[in-house]
């Protein structure tokens, strides 16, 4: 299958950081934490200091304003969440600064942020049928849905 979708030929422009230092919890009340230098995982934790704090940066696209493309950065770092392929873990990649424009294969760094009530979904721009997802005893990855969990609660003001 083609590594990137038809959306990859669009150009996305950075607007601003719209959320600072938030935490992501899945519907099993697992919190996203660092597994190692490269990967994220989800676990039930008692101390929120262990949780990964994210910043969310918003982008615009030239063609589609119905969805909000966002980039996810680990707060106080230069590490950004990057999609790979289905059932592969999302990666942390270091960039010297938040990209002002994103196009082509760089859409791995973008996710469409959708909200339904208190549920938040992050759909890969590079792979529009895949969501950021948690899986039991596994890394945070890209998945279509069950058995992986694709809906998250955003906990703000945890700094």
């Amino acid at each position: 299958s083609a590594p990137f979708s038809f959306l990859s030929n669009m150009t996305y422009h950075f607007i601003r950081i719209i959320k600072h230092e938030f935490i992501l919890n899945d519907t099993l009340n697992q919190t996203i934490i660092r597994a190692n230098d490269q990967y994220l995982t989800a676990a039930a934790i008692h101390n929120l200091d262990e949780a990964v704090k994210f910043d969310m940066g918003a982008y615009t696209s030239s063609k589609d304003d119905t969805k909000v493309p966002v980039i996810l950065r680990i707060s106080k770092t230069q590490l950004y969440v990057s999609a790979q392929d289905e059932d592969q873990p999302v990666l942390l990649k270091e960039m010297p600064e938040i990209p002002k424009t994103i196009t082509g294969s760089e859409t791995n760094f973008l996710f469409f942020w959708e909200t339904h009530g208190t549920k938040n979904y992050f759909i890969s721009v590079a792979h529009p049928n895949l969501f950021i997802a948690t899986k039991h005893d596994n890394w945070v990855c890209l998945a279509k849905g069950l058995p992986s969990i694709t809906d998250f609660q955003i906990l703000e003001n945890q700094a």
Epitope: D37, Q38, Q78, Q84, L91, E94, P96, S105, N108
Partner: antibody, heavy 122, light 107 residues
């Protein structure tokens, strides 16, 4: 333009230590992760180590873990590689390198120094 | 760690030939692959990143393709300055790794 200049190579005895330096110019050094890559005579490229922009994250190849230490001084734009317990198989040209402007660790290495040679005396 | 395997280890070719070099990763790396050219006594030069993106200033006769674990570097029409050794490198894992190299030499 981006420039990376390695120094500190030379002839050393097995088991001893050596410290390599790489002086950077032409870019904002403190914003970039940087790497050491080596090449033994007549052999291929081997990635050795990398350090994140602020020095907080360090990554090592299995072959050097526990013997080599990568560090940086952002105030002086210098990258270091402290090599201890040197072995004959560490004989190589050592290059420092920097990634492309966007993803810098793990990175396609767009800018390289000219290299510095580490060899052993019998 | 991710192992990178290049083939062939050497290829004999003439100016004008089409040359193809392959690289295989021991596990899926999406499109996180780079290709380099190295000439004797010189530092490597980045040709292609993220499997298919041409680095600025690299001639369009160089192209890259592939995704997952199998990748290809193609030189569409070999020029005299292209005789060199070519390396692939995965940039998926923080522990970078290179292929063993492919030497393109005169037939």
């Amino acid at each position: 333009q981006v420039q990376l200049v390695e120094s500190g190579g030379g002839v050393v005895q097995p088991g001893r230590s050596l410290r390599l330096s790489c002086t950077a110019s032409g870019f904002t050094f403190s914003m970039f992760g940087v790497h050491w890559v080596r090449q033994a005579p007549g052999k291929g490229l081997e990635w050795v180590a990398a350090v994140s922009y602020d020095g907080s994250n360090k990554y090592y190849a299995e072959s050097v873990k526990g013997r080599f230490t990568i560090s940086r001084d952002n105030s002086k734009n210098i990258l270091f590689l402290q090599m201890d317990s040197l072995r004959l198989e560490d004989t190589a040209v050592y290059y420092c390198a920097r990634g492309r402007p966007k993803v810098v660790i793990p990175a396609p290495l767009a800018h390289w120094g000219q290299g510095t040679l580490v060899t052993f005396s019998s | 760690d991710i192992q990178m395997t290049q083939s062939p280890s050497s290829v004999s070719a003439s100016v004008g030939d089409r040359v193809t070099i392959t690289c295989r990763a021991s596990q899926g790396i999406s499109s996180w692959l780079a290709w380099y050219q190295q000439k004797p006594g010189k530092a490597p030069k980045l040709l292609i990143y993220e499997a298919s993106n041409l680095e600025t200033g690299v001639p369009s006769r160089f192209s890259g393709s592939g995704s997952g674990s199998d990748f290809t570097l193609t030189i569409s029409s070999l020029q005299p300055e292209d005789f060199a050794t070519y390396y692939c490198q995965q940039t998926s894992s923080f522990l970078l790794s290179f292929g063993g190299g492919t030497k393109v030499e005169h037939k």
